[in-house]
Amino acid sequence: EVEKTACPSGKKAREIDESLIFYKKWELEACVDAALLATQMDRVNAIPFTYEQLDVLKHKLDELYPQGYPESVIQHLGYLFLKMSPEDIRKWNVTSLETLKALLEVNKGHEMSPQVATLIDRFVKGRGQLDKDTLDTLTAFYPGYLCSLSPEELSSVPPSSIWAVRPQDLDTCDPRQLDVLYPKARLAFQNMNGSEYFVKIQSFLGGAPTEDLKALSQQNVSMDLATFMKLRTDAVLPLTVAEVQKLLGPHVEGLKAEERHRPVRDWILRQRQDDLDTLGLGLQG
């Protein structure tokens, strides 16, 4: 807390400019009008203020807006955003994607901080759903964003947003998340032709039921082993040897290297040895 002291004669700030970097903390507090600061927030980032000086500027904004900053100020916070606490951010009403992008840019290259997580949560809740433009933006800054959401949160993602998802965005998703995303992907991509459809749906197949895997096995898709290993064990177990052979195509030879790992291990144990022998891979049930 900075003590309230009178502004020395001639030091009253008429605008936010470089001269302020030479002000002591108490002088900033006494000589910078909060309303002036709010209207000229876009200048703050061009001035090399110290962290201590930024603390004072934040304090002034907090006093001016005790109920939370307006979006006109939030959009121009820049590095001052790093000074905000999740509690501060919970008071905000962020509706513009441009504002969101501006603040994510400040944190770019870093792990998702509690502040950023709170900001995103406020933004998505304000919009009511995770639309395509928002998802595009969030996954561009944080490729793992989608997989940080619970299945419950993913339930509000409209199928149209799935077009924004890249394979790497799903790398850390677990089966429960893919459970929810896979049907949305099926809806989104179903009008594509066979080979294009498989390219798009492949990353989501960890949520596919047995019947869909059987259907894919009839379409010469040549699923790679990495995708096969991410399939739900309960979905793989009912597949016959012939179906797995068709599903994997030339990649079927990779089963040997994965025979001790799920779901391959469990699937092998469910098959008749005679059927496994037809693969010529030396798999033992």
Epitope: P151, R186, L187, Q190, G207, P209, A215
Partner: nanobody, 121 residues
């Protein structure tokens, strides 16, 4: 082409349990990816209540989780919603929804026409 029809009492007293059933005709719900419920309070947007997935996993809106149960009976081609300890804030049009097409080349999302449930004494 599936048809979904919600049924249940249109008026429920506060603190009681709201029970709705969704009856599906025109096809088997065994071929669905999920069976879910969504509601729309008067003058507000849609709110997802919860869904049961083909995998057997059930997911509920965290704000309603302690009060909601969704179950499915594929033999009767029905699924149901129970919402306990209701208040006036639970007054809404309730919709059942499902996405059919497991194992098929096409898939489609279907919705019931909705049923208004009013919570009042």
């Amino acid at each position: 082409q599936l048809q979904l029809q919600e049924s249940g009492p249109g008026l429920v007293k506060p603190s009681e349990t709201l029970s709705l059933t969704c009856t599906v005709s025109g096809g088997s719900i065994s071929n669905s990816y999920y069976w879910g419920w969504i509601r729309q309070p008067p003058g507000k947007g849609l709110e997802w209540i919860g869904s049961i997935y083909h995998s057997g996993n059930t997911y509920y809106n965290p704000s309603l989780k302690s009060r909601v149960t969704i179950s499915v009976d594929t033999s009767k081609n029905q699924f149901s919603l129970k919402l306990s300890s209701v208040t006036a804030a639970d007054t809404a049009v309730y919709y059942c929804t499902t996405q059919n097409g497991v194992g098929a080349t096409t898939t489609e999302e279907y919705w019931g026409q909705g049923t208004l449930v009013t919570v009042s004494s």
